[in-house]
């Protein structure tokens, strides 16, 4: 289990069979029926009660650490409580589920599920170990998704999962400057289903993006745009039901 | 090196409506958010809202959303903070603040009086 | 609204004593917090951001600590010029919310 790992060795990627450098373990606990590792309930995420349930604790199937729910998660649409006990990361590091607006409307009320196409906002810009969540569902017959990590009118970094591309399910990766597209960098692995519920999580690094989709590493993405703190917004848009979009540091 | 130059203070008569500037230079004016934030003088900061300059999208405290709107123009760099109505209760120090916020500008005293 | 408590208004202190100011948020905030230094008549100034990062150009015996819902500044050797009103802030959701201020003093 990864909660024998500190969070440095998990960071590091120092001696933890986690080559990715991801924060503790991924996808390798049990399923619970028709979930993601340690999910509470058929099609939960990792540790997600029923929604509105339990609000600011952890419920039931999410113990501290679990690998696949972050420390005392809550469900989304609830504003977090007080950090799980024993096993989870130690405070200094300790991953919310939920950053800034969390599953909020615009001005920080609890709400439903998020307006899609939505930005989340990102004042400060990004830094290393910052930890975006985006949490949702694949809409049935989806064709496309995409995370644009703006910076102005630019993208820094765009994040675009396409269901039929030429009969193909493909994820392409690029960069917007000035209005041009740049070089596609295209991934064939593609953990998304239509239909199915999501977890897409995106770990800044000093020298690239890592995303993970369902606790599993996915790609990295080398820095185009080095001004990080200049990447001020997160929009997320195409054929998704949005649940909640995040961000922490780690 | 970043700075925020704010309009300087302004009295106004209650009712008539009053627009504050904030003029940026020394960074990229569309790659952060603006922050207004009020201070009444000995109290403490509240946040008002922000804008992102780059598309003028806007997050509004609750609070304020029937008395502030915020707009941008890019082509000056400059941002605005345009108060409905304002009462007595409004005669305090507004700030722009950039980013994070980081920076912010010098403060414009606001004196509403008839 | 997140609310964010500064519990003392006033800290009495003297040139070259280390002095801690606290902050306690009414929710966790994930180490979304910022710290701010405001000296009479002027506007504030960045100190710390996300709990523990020092803006640049801050003097390095300014440190930022905490999670959670707890939260610290400490200065290891109070200098004269360090009297000022100090806020913490929270930036893990709007509306962001400052504290009340804690106004550093000489004895």
């Known amino acids: 289990m990864a909660d024998n790992f500190s969070l440095h060795d998990a960071l590091s990627g120092s001696g933890n069979p986690n080559p990715q450098g991801w924060p503790g373990a991924w996808g390798n606990q049990p399923a619970g029926a028709g979930g993601y590792p340690g999910a509470s309930y058929p099609g939960a995420y990792p540790g997600q009660a029923p929604p509105g349930a339990y609000p600011g604790q952890a419920p039931p199937g999410a113990y501290p650490g679990a690998p696949g729910a972050y420390p005392g998660a809550p469900a989304p649409g609830v504003y977090p409580g007080p950090p799980s006990g024993p096993g989870a990361y130690p405070s200094s590091g300790q991953p919310s589920a939920t950053g800034a607006y969390p599953a909020t409307g615009p001005y920080g009320a609890p709400a439903g599920p998020l307006i899609v196409p939505y930005n989340l906002p990102l004042p400060g810009g990004v830094v290393p170990r910052m930890l975006i969540t985006i949490l949702g569902t694949v809409k049935p017959n989806a064709n496309r998704i995409a995370l644009d990590f703006q910076r102005g009118n630019d993208v820094a970094f765009h994040f675009n999962p396409r269901f039929n591309e030429n009969n193909r399910r493909v994820i392409v990766c690029n960069t917007k400057l000035d209005n041009n597209w740049g070089r596609e960098e295209r991934q064939s692995v593609f953990p998304f289903e239509s239909g199915k519920p999501f977890k897409i999580q995106v770990l800044v690094e000093p020298d690239h993006f890592k995303v993970a989709v369902n606790d599993a590493h996915l790609l990295q993405y080398n820095h185009r745009v080095k001004k990080l703190n200049e990447i001020s917004k997160l929009g997320i848009s195409g054929d998704i039901d949005l649940t909640s979009a995040s961000y922490t540091m780690i | 090196q970043v700075q925020l130059q704010q309009s300087g203070p302004q009295l106004v008569r209650p009712g008539a409506s009053v627009k504050i500037s904030c003029k940026a230079s020394g960074y990229s004016f569309t790659s952060y958010w603006m922050h207004w934030v009020k201070q009444r003088p000995g109290q403490g900061l509240e946040w008002i809202g922000m804008i992102d300059p780059s598309d003028s999208e806007t997050r509004l405290n609750q609070k304020f959303k029937d008395k502030a709107t915020l707009t941008v123009d890019k082509s000056s760099s400059t941002a605005y903070m345009q108060l409905s109505s304002p009462t007595s209760e409004d005669s305090i120090v507004y700030y722009c603040a950039k980013g994070r916020p980081d920076y912010w500008g010098q403060g414009t005293t606001l004196t509403v009086s008839s | 609204d997140i609310a964010m408590t500064q519990s003392h208004k006033f800290m009495s202190t003297s040139v070259g004593d280390r002095v801690s100011i606290t902050c306690k948020a009414s929710?966790?905030?994930?180490?979304?917090v910022a710290w701010y230094q405001q000296k009479p008549g002027q506007s504030p100034k960045l100190l710390i951001y996300w709990a523990s990062t020092r803006h640049t150009g801050v003097p390095d015996r300014f440190t930022g600590s905490g999670s959670g819902t707890d939260y610290t500044l400490t200065i290891s050797s109070v200098q004269a010029e360090d009297l000022a009103l100090y806020y913490c802030?929270?930036?893990?959701?709007?509306?962001?919310?400052f504290g009340g201020g804690t106004k550093l003093e000489i004895k």
């Open positions: 802030q929270q930036h893990y959701n709007t509306p962001y919310t």
């Open positions: 929710q966790d905030v994930s180490t979304a």
